[in-house]
Amino acid sequence: PEPPTACREKQYLINSQCCSLCQPGQKLVSDCTEFTETECLPCGESEFLDTWNRETHCHQHKYCDPNLGLRVQQKGTSETDTICTCEEGWHCTSEACESCVLHRSCSPGFGVKQIATGVSDTICEPCPVGFFSNVSSAFEKCHPWTSCETKDLVVQQAGTNKTDVVCGPQDRLRA
């Protein structure tokens, strides 16, 4: 018979004949022949192959490097890779999450507009007039200046975007 030029799904062409691909989780040991089937072997510990394949080596599971702020979200199997995610307090540098960085803190004079998530950084905003932040924080919003009037006190020192007002007693007229 005429040697094939194309093979069915889950097959590959070699030496003018169609051989079965190895299933996910297995690697190729030897091609099929006229008389024998394709020989495949399971991937070893910490290895995987996620497609029907003719690979002679399995891929190593991804290492979730703590130096890059990564931790294991889902352990790999012989058919799937390990999935990494960011440590608490870190966020991915891209959608694929190949590395993470610490959430940015908002400097004094700035407050947190939006708290960071695993995929997005802290969003800071400048404290408007009447509000302040005197700390560098990834959580603190701008705080309103203390209302001296409600405490029956007067402003002794004006507030800034980094400091609260300083209240003091009202000057009393001496008898």
């Epitope: 996620d50 080596h57 891929h59 190593q60 991804k62 130096n67 890059l68 702020g69 890779d81 540098t93 891209s94 959608e95 694929a96 190949e98 590395s99 960085v101 610490l102 959430h103 940015r104 950084d121």
Partner: antibody, heavy 116, light 108 residues
Framework: EVTLKESGPVLVKPTETLTLTCTVS????????VSWIRQPPGKALEWLAG???????YYASWAKSRLTISRDTNLKQVVLTMTNMDPVDTATYYC??????????WGQGTLVTVSS | AFQLTQSPSSLSASVGDRVTITCQAS??????LAWYQQKPGKPPKLLIV???NLASGVPSRFSGSGSGTDFTLTISSLQPEDFATYYC??????????FGGGTKVEIK
């Protein structure tokens, strides 16, 4: 063993389009991204573009309009095209494993000369 | 546009010297900074990730520090094989994935 190998023309003419291919082995493009980085002779490294393991493409802002990065996960190849080549684009072009991250694995690089 | 400024661009030092290279980011990148060593005709080699963590197989004489916008690479006692060019790289986000201009460490 993880390997990355760049291939493409060694000489291109000004105004032509450069097409470079990075062929990888030892890892899956579904698990790791790949970036292209170049280095003009005697100059600094320049990050050009990256493609994430999820297929997301990223480009250096200064070269965005000239670059296209794509991949074929079955062929284990990542392709970079750069249009309107100029002599200042003469450089060694490297591919490295990783998208927006650090690059622990690099190809050996391919020198591309732009000259008429 | 985001920039990484490395200094000095070159330095001369002797074996045994303590060498310090700085890298300044034009905006905060948290600790999303890496350092590389490159020798002529070779691709760069990763030294430091996350601003201060030694990459696998890198000698302990190399150290990194810094966060935000200011970063430092230190070689505590320069060895003959350390004469090379060093680069910093930011990976905080796609818009700030950039290499510094390099620092060439030469023999005095």
């Amino acid at each position: 063993e993880v390997t990355l190998k760049e291939s493409g023309p060694v000489l291109v003419k000004p105004t032509e389009t450069l097409t470079l291919t990075c062929t990888v082995s030892g890892f899956s493009l579904s698990s790791y991204g790949v970036s292209w980085i170049r280095q003009p002779p005697g100059k600094a490294l320049e990050w050009l573009a990256g493609i994430g393991s999820d297929g997301s493409a990223y480009y250096a802002s200064w070269a965005k309009s000239r670059l296209t990065i794509s991949r074929d996960t079955n062929l284990k190849q990542v392709v970079l095209t750069m249009t309107n080549m100029d002599p200042v684009d003469t450089a060694t072009y490297y591919c490295a494993r990783g998208g927006i991250t650090v690059y622990a694995m690099w190809g050996q690089g391919t020198l591309v000369t732009v000259s008429s | 546009a985001f920039q990484l400024t490395q200094s000095p661009s070159s330095l001369s030092a002797s074996v045994g010297d303590r060498v310090t290279i700085t890298c300044q980011a034009s905006q905060s990148i948290s600790q999303g900074l890496a350092w590389y060593q490159q020798k002529p005709g070779k691709p760069p080699k990763l030294l430091i990730v996350g601003a201060s963590n030694l990459a696998s197989g890198v000698p302990s004489r190399f150290s990194g520090s810094g966060s935000g916008t200011d970063f430092t690479l230190t070689i505590s006692s320069l060895q003959p094989e350390d004469f090379a060019t060093y680069y910093c790289q930011s990976y905080f986000s796609s818009s700030s994935t950039v290499f510094g201009g390099g620092t060439k460490v030469e023999i005095k």
